[in-house]
């Protein structure tokens, strides 16, 4: 699986909450990011996350000169020189600090429900998507058998109508 | 090279039923959304449904719900519209249409040639 | 429901002009937006992509720029062969087509 270019094909500012509208926020602690899923109270502010999206080929036997069999990669940007991670040998989602080209763990493959309802792949694991799993994000392995409808990877995108990125 | 071909378009009359199919190849039909547009005589395209690749979500225009019902079959590489209680404002030549990229609803890469159906007395 | 409006409804130019096509969104659309070419009695084609990527096999006198509500799709010098109605069409929300412009030649 490759990624067809090195620039992202388009990129978008989101507030990202779970299925069951908790939020996704990123705290600095002790010089390092963590990642919370947890209830905002009225009228505060979400955080806001980067998502770039870029083409990515998949290696692929089927006709269509390279035209069929083209996915979409995300990465995601909470802020300047941050991406989330997947560890997979700790099945956990972590920020880290990167410079590009950036890690294939930094890659996730996207999924949809509908254009706000997504979920995240793993590139470096295929079948493990990103999860909640005890108010923290989680690498959860998803069986083929089972429905990717499955609430607890599922995520929502909301506009964000300010285009900085902090 | 990519085909879809639909077929079950004709002339049916209003309250009727009808199942359109398209027969999909070229590609790896069970990692794609798949849709059908429908476009009146003379007029613009309207999207009408779709469906995600293991056809577990499925989405209306609101003028067909409860009338017109999505599915595929994996197995077989071919989508259905299954179409009741036709109306004369459904007439139009439908399309259907494989999504751009494995796994998510963004753009219609390819169509097919369409297949014209007629809702009259 | 997201809706999508195009100007003009009917665009007439010459071979070789630079022609601008405008498609205006109801809400942001987070640049969720291709461009569809329908020449008469065929099938729609996709052009554009996600704004302003070229769909493989497509001229580059086609080009596609915007951000927000407003989008445009430009084709630097028309050709005959451009005669068509051109769709623009939003997934950021739901799937809505805008009502076309039909590009014709002088």
């Known amino acids: 699986m490759s990624i067809t270019g090195i620039s992202p094909i388009t990129e978008y500012l989101a507030s990202l909450s779970t299925y069951n509208d908790q939020s996704i926020t990123f705290a600095l602690e002790d010089e390092s990011y963590e990642i919370y899923v947890e209830d905002l109270k009225k009228d505060e502010k979400k955080d806001k996350v980067l998502l770039s999206y870029y083409e990515s080929q998949h290696p692929s036997n089927e006709s269509g000169d390279g035209v069929d069999g083209k996915m979409l990669m995300v990465t995601l940007s909470p802020t300047k020189d941050f991406w989330l991670h997947a560890n997979n040998k700790e099945h956990s989602v972590e920020l880290h600090k990167s410079e590009k080209p950036l890690p294939d763990q930094a890659f996730f493959v996207l999924h949809n429900m509908h254009s706000n309802s997504v979920s995240f792949e793993s590139k470096t694991d295929p079948g493990v998507f990103i999860g909640v799993k005890d108010n923290h994000l989680a690498l959860i392995k998803v069986d083929s058998s089972e429905n990717l409808s499955t609430e607890n990877i599922l995520f929502k995108l909301s506009e964000t109508h300010h285009h900085h990125h902090h | 090279e990519v085909q879809l071909v639909e077929t079950g378009g004709g002339l049916v009359q209003p309250g009727r039923s009808l199942k359109l199919s398209c027969v999909a190849s070229?590609?790896?039909?069970?990692?794609?959304?798949m849709y059908w547009i429908r476009q009146a005589p003379g007029m613009g395209l309207e999207w009408v449904s779709s469906i995600n690749n293991d056809g577990g979500n499925t989405y209306y225009l609101d003028s067909v719900k409860g009338r017109f019902t999505i599915s595929r079959n994996n197995a077989e590489n071919t989508v259905y519209l299954q179409m009741n209680s036709l109306r004369s404002e459904d007439t139009a030549t439908y399309y259907c249409?494989?999504?751009?990229?494995?796994?998510?609803?963004?753009?219609?890469?390819?169509w097919g040639q369409g297949t014209l159906v007629t809702v009259s007395s | 429901d997201i809706q999508m409006t195009q100007s003009p409804s009917v665009l007439s130019a010459s071979v070789g002009d630079r022609v601008t096509l405008s498609c205006k969104a109801s809400h942001n659309i987070n640049k969720h937006l291709d461009w569809y070419q329908q020449k008469v009695g065929e099938a729609p084609k996709l052009l554009i992509y996600?704004?302003?990527n070229l769909q493989t096999g497509i001229p580059s006198r086609f080009s596609g720029s915007g951000s927000g509500t407003d989008y445009t799709l430009t084709i630097s010098s028309l050709q005959p062969e451009d005669v068509a109605t051109y769709f623009c069409f939003q997934y950021n929300s739901g799937w809505t087509f805008g009502q076309g412009t039909k590009v014709e030649i002088k």
């Open positions: 996600f704004t302003n």
């Open positions: 249409a494989k999504g751009h990229y494995y796994y998510t609803s963004y753009s219609f890469a390819y």
């Open positions: 070229g590609f790896t039909f069970s990692n794609y959304w």
